[in-house]
């Protein structure tokens, strides 16, 4: 159940991550599970543990097997499984099923291709890229952080894209590659300059003292899978997670919604008990994407009691 | 993201059992984690019943294991407390939580439940 | 069971100021290299809300004002600069063994 696959190629690095992770700072204790073995915490290993991590520095097809992490708990020890093959190169061209990543998809619009398991690493930019063997040059291609761009994306573009970067490690220097496949769709879609569609621009939004109040943000961006397109809240200019204000937070992850075609965001803004000061602050509703930013200010206002006339 | 949702009669008669269903949302009680339920009696401060694990095993504070049945159902994504044999003093405000590790990480709102005849 | 006794029961502090809470267990909930007290802020009327777990660790989306401290027996949770916001009942609770258990509250007023 708490099981996960991992590959990797000899004499590459390969960091491993427990299946069952614990927050930070919790003990994790690693295990070659055939011999029951524990695997060292000493960085001078070849493969060694740390924390949530199992490192093989490098690899070598001998590793291959199931390896068991324990995240130690005196109420409720957690064990997960890496299940760990290593494998020999290959010294043609061809990449193996068995060693590719999940297939991502792109479109005239959207080109990004992540390099696969990259977080785990200690490495910095920039990465290499390959496609079917072949190291990308030209303009079209930019290696962006973990991630490539292909620019004006065609249907030759399909293909193997193999990342290739350096993991440092005690100043010693690792080398791994990644690889999956990359499709493309055909997608007749194009981007606006964002429109937002609430709330309206300048709007005084009634709320009671002392009670939860939603803002929503919503925006229009074009037709189709937008590349680079957002929707967020500022407080004073300021971003809510700067603000720190525990009370008002913005709704994890934006929803995406297709109204008429249109590739719309949206972010809820909630504020719990709300207070008099709630209502000093400027809510800005922000929206960019690639052609610009667009900002529509929202003010709150304490809703009256009905007065009731006999 | 977790959201738990506490139910049940809001009144029970001393003696007689309370129950309480947590309904979980965002994520299955089968996969991980453990489910727990804590009470808190009005101005008073918080106090661990027990939990049921993803594997369903149950563990219970010894003060009221004799009374307590944790159990779930897998098919509603749903947890229930019973507590039987009531007093005034089982008066409280009953939270369901979500036991990621060792901390309680996701409540419920809580649900008042006032024994009373 | 092991007993958590907080201190004070209920302590007023001036915007700016430093709290101090401590919390302390009757026996170790230290082993192995790390100690196993947490930390839970509550409001009125709202649920308990995790602030600190492992005697020192902050919890994802937590102001860095909050902090703990402590190992063993005795242990600290720390506000500093306290906020107006930060008016509520503090609770330890441990997870060294069955039951968990928690302290008794302290009350944080704002001056």
């Known amino acids: 159940k708490f099981s996960k696959q991992s590959w990797g190629l000899e004499n590459e690095a390969l960091i491993v991550r427990c299946p069952r992770q614990g927050k930070p700072s919790y003990t994790v204790d690693w295990y070659y599970s055939q011999t029951n073995k524990s695997i060292p915490t000493q960085e001078r290993n070849r493969v060694f543990a740390s924390g949530q991590l199992l490192k093989f520095l490098p690899a070598a097809v001998a590793d291959s097997g199931i390896y068991t992490c324990i995240v130690r708990s005196p109420t409720f020890n957690r064990t997960g499984y890496a299940n760990v093959t290593i494998y020999k190169k290959q010294s043609d061209c061809n990449v193996p099923d068995y060693l590719m990543y999940s297939t991502v998809s792109g479109s005239e619009k959207n080109s990004k291709i992540y390099c696969p398991t990259i977080d785990l690493y200690n490495w910095t930019a920039p990465l290499e890229w390959f496609k079917n063997c072949q190291a990308l040059q030209g303009s079209r291609y930019r290696a962006h952080k973990s991630f490539l761009v292909i620019d004006n994306v065609m249907t030759e573009d399909a293909g193997d894209y193999t990342c290739k970067f350096i993991h440092n490690e005690n100043g010693a220097n690792y080398s791994v590659t990644a690889t999956r496949s990359f499709t493309v769709k055909d997608e007749q879609g194009f981007s606006l300059f964002p429109v937002i569609g609430a709330p309206a621009q300048n709007e005084i939004k009634e709320v009671e003292i002392g009670k939860n109040a939603n803002l929503t943000c919503s925006a229009c961006f074009g037709k189709g899978t937008q590349f680079l397109a957002a929707v967020l809240w500022q407080l004073n200019g300021t971003k809510i997670t700067d603000f720190g204000e525990p009370r008002i937070q913005q709704e994890e992850g934006q929803n995406q919604s297709f109204s008429n075609g249109l590739a719309c965001l949206d972010m809820v803004l909630r504020i719990a008990d709300v207070k008099e000061e709630d209502l000093l602050l400027q809510y800005d509703c922000l929206a960019l994407n690639l052609h610009g930013l667009r900002r529509h200010t929202v003010r709150l206002s304490r809703k009256n009691p009905i007065d009731h006339h006999s | 993201q977790v959201q738990l949702q506490e139910s049940g009669p809001g009144l029970v008669k001393p003696s007689q059992t309370l129950s309480l269903t947590c309904t979980v949302s965002?994520?299955?009680?089968?996969?991980?984690?453990?489910w727990d339920w804590i009470r808190q009696p009005p101005g008073k401060g918080l106090e661990w019943i027990g939990y049921?694990?993803?594997?369903?095993?149950?563990y219970y504070n010894p003060s009221l294991k004799s009374r307590v049945t944790i159990s779930r159902d897998t098919s509603k994504n749903q947890f229930s407390l019973k507590l039987s044999s009531v007093t005034a003093a089982d008066t409280a405000v009953y939270y369901c939580a979500t036991t990621m590790m060792d901390t309680m990480d996701y409540w419920g709102q809580g649900t008042l439940v006032t024994v009373s005849s | 069971d092991i007993v958590l006794t907080q201190s004070p029961a209920s302590l007023a502090v001036s915007p700016g100021q430093r709290a101090t809470i401590t919390c302390r267990a009757s026996k170790s909930v230290s082993t192995s290299g790390n100690s196993y007290m947490h930390w839970y802020q509550q409001k009125p009327g709202q649920p308990p809300k995790l602030l600190i777990y492992?005697?020192?660790n902050l919890e994802s989306g937590v102001p860095a004002r909050f902090s703990g401290s402590g190992s063993g027996t005795d242990f600290t949770l720390t506000i500093n600069p306290v906020e107006a916001n930060d008016a509520a009942n503090y609770y330890c609770?441990?997870?060294?063994?069955?039951?968990?258990?928690f302290g008794q509250g302290t009350k944080l007023e704002i001056k």
């Open positions: 609770q441990h997870s060294r063994e069955f039951p968990l258990t």
């Open positions: 049921i694990r993803y594997s369903g095993d149950t």
């Open positions: 492992l005697a020192s």
């Open positions: 965002g994520y299955s009680i089968t996969s991980d984690y453990a």
